[in-house]
């Protein structure tokens, strides 16, 4: 392992929202774990990076991810509210020059090496739908979230507000 040591009904026109400026409003390192306290880890295998969801052994160090938060402006004519709205979008980078990407065709979450400006597939709308947990919704595919499937990260379609609290799309961030 290595480190650097809504829903369609609720989400409209995400792909049209403009990210305010090109600089993140804040960045920090955190470990990512599931609702059930399994760790998200990253490993180099056959010259590509794999993402795993696993129980760590006692005292095993958690991988850290650089979370970069961006503000995204929603003009009032798109928001449906009659007011300009703002969202938080996040990119996740577990090591230099690599970012989590949504592969909507394969319904998978992958690590890709890329340069800035990052493609839309690397941006996720941040939700906190549950106490002290967050969810990551694809900017490119509203209603699709990063989730856990068979000990891997995958893209999961959430089709109703009731499912926004499904445990497999909830993650915890920890800076310790």
């Amino acid at each position: 392992a290595f480190g650097i040591s809504g829903v369609q009904k609720y989400t409209r026109a995400l792909h049209d929202s403009s990210i305010t400026g090109i600089s993140p409003i804040t960045e920090y390192l955190a470990s990512l774990s599931t609702y059930n306290d399994q760790s998200i880890t990253f490993a180099l295998e056959d010259e590509s990076y794999e993402i795993y969801v696993e129980d760590l052994k006692k005292d095993e160090k958690k991988d850290k991810v650089l979370l970069s938060y961006y503000e995204s402006q929603h003009p009032s004519n798109e928001s449906g509210d009659g007011v300009d709205g703002k969202m938080l979008m996040v990119t996740l980078s577990p090591t230099k020059d690599f970012w989590l990407h949504a592969n909507n065709k394969e319904h998978s979450v992958e690590l890709h090496k890329c340069e800035k400006p990052l493609p839309d597939q690397a941006f996720f709308v941040l939700h906190n739908m549950h106490s002290n947990c967050v969810s990551f919704e694809c900017k490119t595919d509203p209603g699709v979230f990063i989730g856990v499937k068979d000990n891997h990260l995958a893209l999961i379609k959430v089709d109703s507000s009731e499912n926004l609290c499904t445990e497999n799309i909830l993650f915890k961030l920890s800076e310790t």
Partner: antibody, heavy 121, light 107 residues
Framework: QVHLKESGPGLVAPSQSLSITCNVS????????VHWIRQTPGRGLDWLGV???????SYNSALMSRLSISEDISKSQVFLKMNDLQTDDSAIYFC???????????????WGQGTLVTVSA | DIQMTQSPASQSASLGESVTITCLAS??????LAWYQQKPGKSPQLLIY???RLADGVPSRFSGSGSGTEFSFKISSLQAEDFVIYYC?????????FGGGTKLEIK
Amino acid sequence: QVHLKESGPGLVAPSQSLSITCNVSGFSLSKYGVHWIRQTPGRGLDWLGVLRAGGTISYNSALMSRLSISEDISKSQVFLKMNDLQTDDSAIYFCARDHYYYSSFGGFASWGQGTLVTVSA
Amino acid sequence: DIQMTQSPASQSASLGESVTITCLASQTIATWLAWYQQKPGKSPQLLIYAATRLADGVPSRFSGSGSGTEFSFKISSLQAEDFVIYYCQQLYNTPYTFGGGTKLEIK
């Protein structure tokens, strides 16, 4: 124009329950969380709970057994119910809207005017 | 729960001066901190969010800094209407706790 307005009973007898309505306009409850906060001269500002976009609810665990938050999306209303009120629950009760869609990380951008609740026999 | 310790509880200053208020979190809160202003008989108003970001319509004489557990809020060139109460609030974890407030008084 974003607007939130609380309406409450004013006076509540000890051991009785409190019901407050927050009427909202200018934004959608399906995009923004609405929080309940109360303020007393002695304790300052206390966060009570939130009805998040999508309908999930988080409470302050210290008051969780006495609190209930709900909504009527069709009427753009959020409700706070609190049971077994005591004199130290006397406070101004506010509802407030998240700054960001779907997330509370940006603080509370719009607040209601507040409603004064006095618990007294 | 995360405790927010705000200091000073009150401060006297003159028009045109600068003042700084600090807020200490009992554990790391990244940059998820907001500052509010409350005028007498009114509800709090968001001034700063995400520790450093100025809310819409807020004058540039207000600024915020810090991350982790230590945060500062500065008002440069105090105006008459600034002599009110200011609160910090952490948005990192529920319950979203507030500092005890700082009352700015005119000297």
